[in-house]
Protein backbone atom coordinates (compact mmCIF):
# COMPACT_ATOMS: atom_id res chain seq x y z
CA UNK A 1 0.00 0.00 0.00
CA UNK A 2 1.05 3.62 -0.28
CA UNK A 3 0.66 6.65 1.91
CA UNK A 4 -1.41 9.01 -0.16
CA UNK A 5 -2.29 12.01 1.98
CA UNK A 6 -0.11 14.31 3.97
CA UNK A 7 -1.27 13.25 7.41
CA UNK A 8 0.44 12.41 10.63
CA UNK A 9 -1.21 10.09 13.10
CA UNK A 10 -0.99 10.33 16.87
CA UNK A 11 1.32 7.82 18.53
CA UNK A 12 1.62 7.68 22.32
CA UNK A 13 4.27 5.95 24.43
CA UNK A 14 4.82 5.59 28.16
CA UNK A 15 8.24 5.62 29.83
CA UNK A 16 8.77 2.36 31.68
CA UNK A 17 11.24 0.11 33.45
CA UNK A 18 12.23 -3.49 32.96
CA UNK A 19 13.21 -6.00 35.62
CA UNK A 20 16.39 -7.87 34.59
CA UNK A 21 15.70 -11.51 33.74
CA UNK A 22 11.96 -11.01 33.58
CA UNK A 23 9.68 -9.98 30.70
CA UNK A 24 8.96 -6.32 30.10
CA UNK A 25 6.49 -4.21 28.13
CA UNK A 26 7.29 -1.15 26.02
CA UNK A 27 3.95 0.64 25.73
CA UNK A 28 2.76 2.27 22.50
CA UNK A 29 -0.69 3.10 21.18
CA UNK A 30 -1.82 4.73 17.94
CA UNK A 31 -4.91 5.82 16.00
CA UNK A 32 -6.23 2.49 14.72
CA UNK A 33 -6.84 1.58 11.10
CA UNK A 34 -9.72 -0.50 9.78
CA UNK A 35 -7.45 -2.91 7.88
CA UNK A 36 -4.74 -4.88 9.68
CA UNK A 37 -2.86 -5.34 6.40
CA UNK A 38 -2.43 -1.55 6.18
CA UNK A 39 -0.63 -1.26 9.52
CA UNK A 40 3.15 -1.33 9.90
CA UNK A 41 4.78 -1.21 13.34
CA UNK A 42 8.50 -0.63 13.64
CA UNK A 43 10.33 -0.54 16.96
CA UNK A 44 13.79 1.04 16.89
CA UNK A 45 16.42 1.56 19.55
CA UNK A 46 18.90 4.44 19.52
CA UNK A 47 22.38 3.12 18.84
CA UNK A 48 21.16 -0.13 17.28
CA UNK A 49 21.43 -0.61 13.50
CA UNK A 50 18.85 -3.32 12.95
CA UNK A 51 15.21 -3.12 13.98
CA UNK A 52 14.04 -4.17 17.42
CA UNK A 53 10.84 -5.52 15.87
CA UNK A 54 8.71 -5.08 12.77
CA UNK A 55 5.07 -6.09 12.24
CA UNK A 56 3.51 -5.64 8.82
CA UNK A 57 0.71 -7.13 6.74
CA UNK A 58 -0.68 -8.80 9.84
CA UNK A 59 2.46 -10.69 10.86
CA UNK A 60 5.99 -10.31 12.22
CA UNK A 61 8.63 -9.32 9.66
CA UNK A 62 11.95 -10.04 11.33
CA UNK A 63 14.40 -10.11 8.41
CA UNK A 64 15.96 -6.82 9.56
CA UNK A 65 15.81 -7.55 13.28
CA UNK A 66 18.98 -6.80 15.21
CA UNK A 67 20.84 -9.76 16.67
CA UNK A 68 20.53 -8.49 20.24
CA UNK A 69 16.73 -8.82 20.08
CA UNK A 70 16.53 -12.11 18.20
CA UNK A 71 13.84 -14.36 19.70
CA UNK A 72 13.02 -11.89 22.48
CA UNK A 73 10.30 -9.65 21.03
CA UNK A 74 6.61 -9.88 20.21
CA UNK A 75 3.70 -7.53 19.62
CA UNK A 76 0.18 -8.30 20.78
CA UNK A 77 -0.99 -9.27 17.28
CA UNK A 78 -4.67 -9.50 18.14
CA UNK A 79 -4.62 -5.98 19.62
CA UNK A 80 -2.86 -4.19 16.76
CA UNK A 81 -6.15 -3.58 14.94
CA UNK A 82 -7.42 -1.56 17.94
CA UNK A 83 -4.27 0.58 18.07
CA UNK A 84 -2.01 -1.31 20.47
CA UNK A 85 1.58 -1.43 19.22
CA UNK A 86 3.11 -2.33 22.58
CA UNK A 87 6.14 -4.58 22.51
CA UNK A 88 6.75 -7.51 24.79
CA UNK A 89 10.44 -7.91 25.55
CA UNK A 90 11.45 -11.29 26.93
CA UNK A 91 14.27 -11.84 29.42
CA UNK A 92 15.13 -8.17 29.92
CA UNK A 93 18.87 -7.43 29.88
CA UNK A 94 20.71 -4.53 31.50
CA UNK A 95 21.78 -3.47 27.99
CA UNK A 96 18.15 -3.11 26.87
CA UNK A 97 18.05 0.28 28.60
CA UNK A 98 17.90 3.28 26.30
CA UNK A 99 15.72 5.34 23.98
CA UNK A 100 13.23 3.49 21.80
CA UNK A 101 11.05 4.73 18.97
CA UNK A 102 7.62 3.33 18.16
CA UNK A 103 7.11 4.10 14.46
CA UNK A 104 3.67 3.52 12.93
CA UNK A 105 2.52 3.55 9.32
CA UNK A 106 -1.17 3.18 8.42
CA UNK A 107 -3.35 4.11 5.45
CA UNK A 108 -4.14 7.33 7.36
CA UNK A 109 -0.50 8.37 7.60
CA UNK A 110 2.57 8.01 9.78
CA UNK A 111 3.55 8.85 13.31
CA UNK A 112 6.17 8.06 15.91
CA UNK A 113 6.97 8.58 19.56
CA UNK A 114 10.04 7.93 21.69
CA UNK A 115 10.20 6.31 25.09
CA UNK A 116 12.91 5.96 27.70
CA UNK A 117 13.30 2.41 28.95
CA UNK A 118 15.22 1.86 32.15
CA UNK A 119 16.48 -1.52 33.25
CA UNK A 120 17.48 -2.78 36.65
CA UNK A 121 16.25 -5.10 39.34
CA UNK A 122 13.64 -4.44 41.98
CA UNK A 123 11.73 -6.68 44.32
CA UNK A 124 9.30 -6.53 47.20
CA UNK A 125 10.87 -6.37 50.66
CA UNK A 126 9.70 -8.57 53.49
CA UNK A 127 10.07 -7.42 57.08
CA UNK A 128 10.19 -9.95 59.89
CA UNK A 129 10.90 -9.98 63.57
CA UNK A 130 14.33 -11.49 64.21
CA UNK A 131 13.75 -13.73 67.19
CA UNK A 132 17.37 -14.95 67.20
CA UNK A 133 18.71 -11.54 68.09
CA UNK A 134 19.55 -10.59 71.67
CA UNK A 135 17.34 -7.48 71.55
CA UNK A 136 14.08 -6.75 69.73
CA UNK A 137 15.24 -6.63 66.10
CA UNK A 138 13.58 -6.33 62.67
CA UNK A 139 15.05 -7.82 59.53
CA UNK A 140 14.15 -6.41 56.10
CA UNK A 141 15.07 -8.57 53.09
CA UNK A 142 14.63 -8.04 49.35
CA UNK A 143 16.07 -10.66 46.98
CA UNK A 144 16.97 -8.66 43.82
CA UNK A 145 18.02 -5.04 43.37
CA UNK A 146 20.17 -3.16 40.85
CA UNK A 147 21.64 -0.55 40.83
CA UNK A 148 22.52 -0.60 44.52
CA UNK A 149 19.65 1.03 46.40
CA UNK A 150 19.47 3.13 49.54
CA UNK A 151 17.66 1.71 52.57
CA UNK A 152 15.89 3.95 55.07
CA UNK A 153 13.92 2.92 58.14
CA UNK A 154 10.97 4.92 59.47
CA UNK A 155 8.55 4.52 62.34
CA UNK A 156 4.98 5.66 62.84
CA UNK A 157 5.54 6.59 66.48
CA UNK A 158 8.91 8.32 66.03
CA UNK A 159 8.12 10.22 62.85
CA UNK A 160 11.14 12.01 61.42
CA UNK A 161 13.55 9.98 63.53
CA UNK A 162 16.89 8.97 61.99
CA UNK A 163 17.45 5.24 62.39
CA UNK A 164 20.81 5.08 60.62
CA UNK A 165 22.67 4.70 63.92
CA UNK A 166 20.54 1.74 65.02
CA UNK A 167 20.37 -0.09 61.69
CA UNK A 168 22.80 -2.04 59.56
CA UNK A 169 22.41 -2.67 55.81
CA UNK A 170 24.32 -5.15 53.66
CA UNK A 171 24.29 -5.96 49.95
CA UNK A 172 25.10 -9.48 48.79
CA UNK A 173 25.83 -10.12 45.11
CA UNK A 174 23.56 -12.77 43.60
CA UNK A 175 24.85 -15.70 41.58
CA UNK A 176 24.40 -13.97 38.18
CA UNK A 177 26.84 -11.25 39.38
CA UNK A 178 24.58 -8.30 38.58
CA UNK A 179 21.71 -8.07 41.04
CA UNK A 180 22.12 -8.01 44.79
CA UNK A 181 20.21 -9.21 47.81
CA UNK A 182 19.42 -6.41 50.25
CA UNK A 183 19.38 -7.14 53.98
CA UNK A 184 18.80 -4.42 56.55
CA UNK A 185 18.53 -4.96 60.30
CA UNK A 186 16.92 -2.49 62.71
CA UNK A 187 17.81 -2.75 66.39
CA UNK A 188 16.10 -1.54 69.61
CA UNK A 189 12.59 -1.99 68.26
CA UNK A 190 9.71 -1.02 70.53
CA UNK A 191 6.40 -2.83 70.74
CA UNK A 192 3.08 -1.28 69.58
CA UNK A 193 4.66 0.51 66.65
CA UNK A 194 4.67 0.32 62.85
CA UNK A 195 8.06 0.27 61.14
CA UNK A 196 8.76 0.83 57.47
CA UNK A 197 11.78 -0.38 55.51
CA UNK A 198 12.11 1.76 52.37
CA UNK A 199 14.36 0.57 49.53
CA UNK A 200 14.93 2.89 46.60
CA UNK A 201 17.10 3.29 43.49
CA UNK A 202 16.56 5.40 40.38
CA UNK A 203 14.16 2.82 38.93
CA UNK A 204 11.91 1.74 41.78
CA UNK A 205 10.89 2.43 45.33
CA UNK A 206 9.65 -0.38 47.56
CA UNK A 207 8.34 -0.29 51.10
CA UNK A 208 7.87 -3.10 53.58
CA UNK A 209 5.76 -2.28 56.64
CA UNK A 210 5.45 -4.28 59.82
CA UNK A 211 3.10 -3.53 62.71
CA UNK A 212 4.23 -5.15 65.93
CA UNK A 213 1.86 -5.40 68.88
CA UNK A 214 1.78 -7.74 71.86
CA UNK A 215 -0.96 -9.82 70.28
CA UNK A 216 -0.12 -9.82 66.53
CA UNK A 217 2.23 -8.94 63.71
CA UNK A 218 0.87 -7.38 60.50
CA UNK A 219 2.91 -6.98 57.30
CA UNK A 220 2.34 -5.02 54.11
CA UNK A 221 4.55 -4.43 51.06
CA UNK A 222 4.34 -1.97 48.21
CA UNK A 223 6.46 -1.39 45.08
CA UNK A 224 6.34 1.64 42.82
CA UNK A 225 8.25 2.26 39.58
CA UNK A 226 9.74 5.74 39.38
CA UNK A 227 9.68 8.15 36.42
CA UNK A 228 6.95 6.21 34.64
CA UNK A 229 4.43 8.62 33.17
CA UNK A 230 1.06 7.03 33.74
Amino acid sequence: FGISGRHSITVTTVASAGNIGEDGILSCTFEPDIKLSDIVIQWLKEGVLGLVHEFKEGKDELSEQDEMFRGRTAVFADQVIVGNASLRLKNVQLTDAGTYKCYIITSKGKGNANLEYKTGAFSMPEVNVDYNASSETLRCEAPRWFPQPTVVWASQVDQGANFSEVSNTSFELNSENVTMKVVSVLYNVTINNTYSCMIENDIAKATGDIKVTESEIKRRSHLQLLNSKA
Epitope: F1, S4, G47, V48, D66, E67, M68, G98, I105
Partner: antibody, heavy 117, light 105 residues
Framework: EVQLVESGGGVVQPGRSLRLSCAAS????????MNWVRQAPGKGLEWVSA????????YYADSVKGRFTISRDNSKNTLYLQMNSLRAEDTAVYYC??????????WGQGTTVTVSS | SYELTQPPSVSVAPGKTARITCGGN??????VHWYQQKPGQAPVLVVY???DRPSGIPERFSGSNSGNTATLTISRVEAGDEADYYC????????FGTGTKLTVL
Amino acid sequence: EVQLVESGGGVVQPGRSLRLSCAASGFTYSSRAMNWVRQAPGKGLEWVSAISSSGTTTYYADSVKGRFTISRDNSKNTLYLQMNSLRAEDTAVYYCARKRWYGMDVWGQGTTVTVSS
Amino acid sequence: SYELTQPPSVSVAPGKTARITCGGNNIGSKSVHWYQQKPGQAPVLVVYDDSDRPSGIPERFSGSNSGNTATLTISRVEAGDEADYYCQVWDRGMIFGTGTKLTVL
Protein backbone atom coordinates in the same frame (compact mmCIF):
# COMPACT_ATOMS: atom_id res chain seq x y z
CA GLU B 1 29.33 21.48 21.90
CA VAL B 2 28.78 18.31 19.88
CA GLN B 3 31.76 17.78 17.60
CA LEU B 4 33.19 15.18 15.21
CA VAL B 5 36.74 15.61 13.90
CA GLU B 6 38.12 13.31 11.20
CA SER B 7 41.81 12.66 10.58
CA GLY B 8 44.08 10.22 8.77
CA GLY B 9 43.42 11.21 5.17
CA GLY B 10 46.19 11.61 2.63
CA VAL B 11 47.60 10.46 -0.68
CA VAL B 12 48.03 6.71 -1.09
CA GLN B 13 48.88 4.37 -3.96
CA PRO B 14 46.31 1.93 -5.35
CA GLY B 15 46.31 -1.38 -3.47
CA ARG B 16 47.64 0.20 -0.28
CA SER B 17 45.87 0.79 3.04
CA LEU B 18 44.85 3.79 5.14
CA ARG B 19 43.09 4.19 8.47
CA LEU B 20 40.79 7.10 9.17
CA SER B 21 39.85 8.25 12.66
CA CYS B 22 36.98 10.34 13.96
CA ALA B 23 37.18 11.89 17.44
CA ALA B 24 33.80 12.55 19.04
CA SER B 25 33.07 14.99 21.84
CA GLY B 26 30.17 16.77 23.50
CA PHE B 27 27.79 13.79 23.68
CA THR B 28 27.56 10.26 25.06
CA TYR B 29 29.44 8.59 22.23
CA SER B 30 28.96 5.05 23.56
CA SER B 31 25.18 5.25 23.14
CA ARG B 32 25.06 6.36 19.49
CA ALA B 33 25.48 4.47 16.24
CA MET B 34 27.92 6.07 13.79
CA ASN B 35 28.46 6.24 10.01
CA TRP B 36 31.10 6.95 7.41
CA VAL B 37 29.90 8.82 4.30
CA ARG B 38 32.07 9.84 1.38
CA GLN B 39 31.90 12.32 -1.49
CA ALA B 40 34.00 11.94 -4.63
CA PRO B 41 35.16 15.20 -6.25
CA GLY B 42 32.19 16.89 -7.94
CA LYS B 43 29.86 14.03 -7.04
CA GLY B 44 27.06 13.37 -4.57
CA LEU B 45 27.04 11.79 -1.11
CA GLU B 46 27.64 8.05 -0.82
CA TRP B 47 27.12 6.12 2.40
CA VAL B 48 30.06 3.81 3.20
CA SER B 49 29.47 2.05 6.50
CA ALA B 50 27.63 2.09 9.84
CA ILE B 51 28.36 0.65 13.28
CA SER B 52 26.11 0.14 16.29
CA SER B 53 26.77 1.86 19.61
CA SER B 54 28.34 -1.27 21.10
CA GLY B 55 30.32 -2.06 17.95
CA THR B 56 28.75 -5.51 17.60
CA THR B 57 26.79 -4.79 14.41
CA THR B 58 28.25 -3.32 11.23
CA TYR B 59 26.78 -2.58 7.79
CA TYR B 60 28.70 -1.80 4.58
CA ALA B 61 27.92 -0.46 1.13
CA ASP B 62 28.46 -3.07 -1.59
CA SER B 63 31.22 -0.92 -3.12
CA VAL B 64 33.48 -1.33 -0.06
CA LYS B 65 32.38 -4.70 1.37
CA GLY B 66 35.37 -6.95 2.06
CA ARG B 67 37.87 -4.08 1.75
CA PHE B 68 36.83 -1.60 4.44
CA THR B 69 36.31 -2.28 8.16
CA ILE B 70 34.48 0.06 10.51
CA SER B 71 35.28 -0.12 14.24
CA ARG B 72 35.06 2.00 17.36
CA ASP B 73 36.72 2.47 20.74
CA ASN B 74 34.13 3.76 23.19
CA SER B 75 36.75 4.32 25.87
CA LYS B 76 38.50 6.77 23.52
CA ASN B 77 35.34 8.22 21.94
CA THR B 78 36.80 7.38 18.55
CA LEU B 79 35.44 5.89 15.32
CA TYR B 80 37.72 4.21 12.77
CA LEU B 81 37.62 3.20 9.12
CA GLN B 82 40.31 0.77 8.01
CA MET B 83 40.57 0.96 4.23
CA ASN B 84 42.45 -1.83 2.45
CA SER B 85 43.06 -2.55 -1.24
CA LEU B 86 42.34 1.05 -2.11
CA ARG B 87 41.24 1.95 -5.64
CA ALA B 88 41.19 5.19 -7.60
CA GLU B 89 37.39 5.30 -7.21
CA ASP B 90 37.81 5.48 -3.42
CA THR B 91 39.20 9.01 -3.83
CA ALA B 92 36.84 11.25 -1.88
CA VAL B 93 36.25 13.41 1.15
CA TYR B 94 35.30 11.05 4.00
CA TYR B 95 32.87 12.28 6.65
CA CYS B 96 31.94 10.63 9.91
CA ALA B 97 28.36 11.27 10.95
CA ARG B 98 26.30 10.46 14.01
CA LYS B 99 23.27 8.29 13.29
CA ARG B 100 19.93 9.52 14.58
CA TRP B 101 17.19 6.96 14.03
CA TYR B 102 16.91 6.73 10.24
CA GLY B 103 19.11 9.76 9.53
CA MET B 104 22.29 11.60 10.54
CA ASP B 105 22.19 14.67 12.74
CA VAL B 106 25.85 15.66 13.22
CA TRP B 107 28.67 15.58 10.66
CA GLY B 108 32.41 16.11 10.88
CA GLN B 109 34.26 18.49 8.58
CA GLY B 110 35.71 15.63 6.51
CA THR B 111 39.15 14.28 5.65
CA THR B 112 40.43 13.90 2.08
CA VAL B 113 41.66 10.58 0.71
CA THR B 114 43.40 10.56 -2.66
CA VAL B 115 44.25 7.23 -4.29
CA SER B 116 46.77 7.80 -7.04
CA SER B 117 49.90 6.21 -8.42
CA SER C 1 18.47 -1.69 -4.24
CA TYR C 2 16.37 1.36 -3.34
CA GLU C 3 16.95 4.47 -5.47
CA LEU C 4 16.14 8.12 -4.87
CA THR C 5 15.85 10.54 -7.79
CA GLN C 6 16.22 14.31 -7.54
CA PRO C 7 16.24 16.99 -10.25
CA PRO C 8 19.85 18.05 -10.94
CA SER C 9 19.03 21.74 -10.53
CA VAL C 10 16.35 24.13 -9.35
CA SER C 11 16.44 27.90 -9.87
CA VAL C 12 14.45 30.44 -7.92
CA ALA C 13 14.32 34.20 -7.49
CA PRO C 14 15.00 35.68 -4.04
CA GLY C 15 11.87 35.90 -1.90
CA LYS C 16 10.11 33.18 -3.87
CA THR C 17 9.46 29.55 -2.92
CA ALA C 18 11.72 26.69 -4.01
CA ARG C 19 10.51 23.10 -4.12
CA ILE C 20 12.98 20.24 -4.42
CA THR C 21 11.54 16.78 -5.02
CA CYS C 22 12.85 13.34 -4.15
CA GLY C 23 11.28 10.37 -5.92
CA GLY C 24 11.33 6.79 -4.70
CA ASN C 25 9.09 3.75 -4.82
CA ASN C 26 6.44 4.21 -2.09
CA ILE C 27 8.74 6.72 -0.36
CA GLY C 28 5.70 7.87 1.63
CA SER C 29 6.12 4.80 3.84
CA LYS C 30 9.69 5.78 4.68
CA SER C 31 11.20 8.46 6.89
CA VAL C 32 12.92 11.10 4.72
CA HIS C 33 15.73 13.44 5.78
CA TRP C 34 17.14 16.44 3.92
CA TYR C 35 20.69 17.84 4.02
CA GLN C 36 22.07 21.14 2.82
CA GLN C 37 25.67 21.27 1.63
CA LYS C 38 27.45 24.48 0.73
CA PRO C 39 30.69 24.40 -1.32
CA GLY C 40 33.68 23.15 0.69
CA GLN C 41 31.53 22.41 3.75
CA ALA C 42 30.07 19.33 5.41
CA PRO C 43 26.37 18.54 4.96
CA VAL C 44 23.91 19.96 7.50
CA LEU C 45 20.61 18.34 8.45
CA VAL C 46 17.77 20.75 7.63
CA VAL C 47 14.69 18.48 7.82
CA TYR C 48 14.27 15.08 9.47
CA ASP C 49 11.44 12.53 9.69
CA ASP C 50 9.75 14.02 6.58
CA SER C 51 8.84 17.39 8.07
CA ASP C 52 10.59 18.10 11.39
CA ARG C 53 13.22 20.82 11.72
CA PRO C 54 16.35 20.59 13.90
CA SER C 55 16.89 23.50 16.27
CA GLY C 56 18.62 26.41 14.56
CA ILE C 57 17.09 25.71 11.14
CA PRO C 58 14.78 28.55 9.98
CA GLU C 59 11.02 27.94 9.72
CA ARG C 60 11.34 28.70 6.01
CA PHE C 61 12.51 25.09 5.58
CA SER C 62 9.73 22.51 5.57
CA GLY C 63 9.15 19.04 4.22
CA SER C 64 6.39 16.71 3.15
CA ASN C 65 6.24 13.11 2.01
CA SER C 66 3.48 11.09 0.39
CA GLY C 67 3.03 8.50 -2.31
CA ASN C 68 6.21 8.26 -4.38
CA THR C 69 7.51 11.78 -3.76
CA ALA C 70 9.04 13.67 -0.85
CA THR C 71 9.42 17.43 -1.13
CA LEU C 72 11.68 19.98 0.53
CA THR C 73 10.11 23.44 0.43
CA ILE C 74 12.12 26.59 1.07
CA SER C 75 9.94 29.67 1.32
CA ARG C 76 11.16 33.29 1.01
CA VAL C 77 14.41 32.07 -0.50
CA GLU C 78 17.57 33.98 0.39
CA ALA C 79 20.93 34.15 -1.37
CA GLY C 80 22.45 32.16 1.52
CA ASP C 81 20.20 29.18 0.69
CA GLU C 82 22.18 28.52 -2.49
CA ALA C 83 23.64 25.04 -1.99
CA ASP C 84 23.33 21.38 -2.91
CA TYR C 85 20.42 19.53 -1.27
CA TYR C 86 20.25 15.78 -0.70
CA CYS C 87 17.34 13.63 0.42
CA GLN C 88 18.07 10.41 2.33
CA VAL C 89 16.27 7.34 3.64
CA TRP C 90 17.40 4.25 5.55
CA ASP C 91 17.19 0.88 3.85
CA ARG C 92 19.74 -1.37 5.58
CA GLY C 93 22.11 1.50 5.07
CA MET C 94 21.83 5.18 4.25
CA ILE C 95 20.48 5.80 0.74
CA PHE C 96 21.09 9.29 -0.66
CA GLY C 97 19.33 11.03 -3.47
CA THR C 98 21.28 12.18 -6.50
CA GLY C 99 21.41 15.75 -5.20
CA THR C 100 19.90 19.04 -6.38
CA LYS C 101 21.80 22.28 -6.94
CA LEU C 102 19.67 25.22 -5.82
CA THR C 103 20.53 28.43 -7.63
CA VAL C 104 19.22 31.75 -6.34
CA LEU C 105 18.83 34.05 -9.34
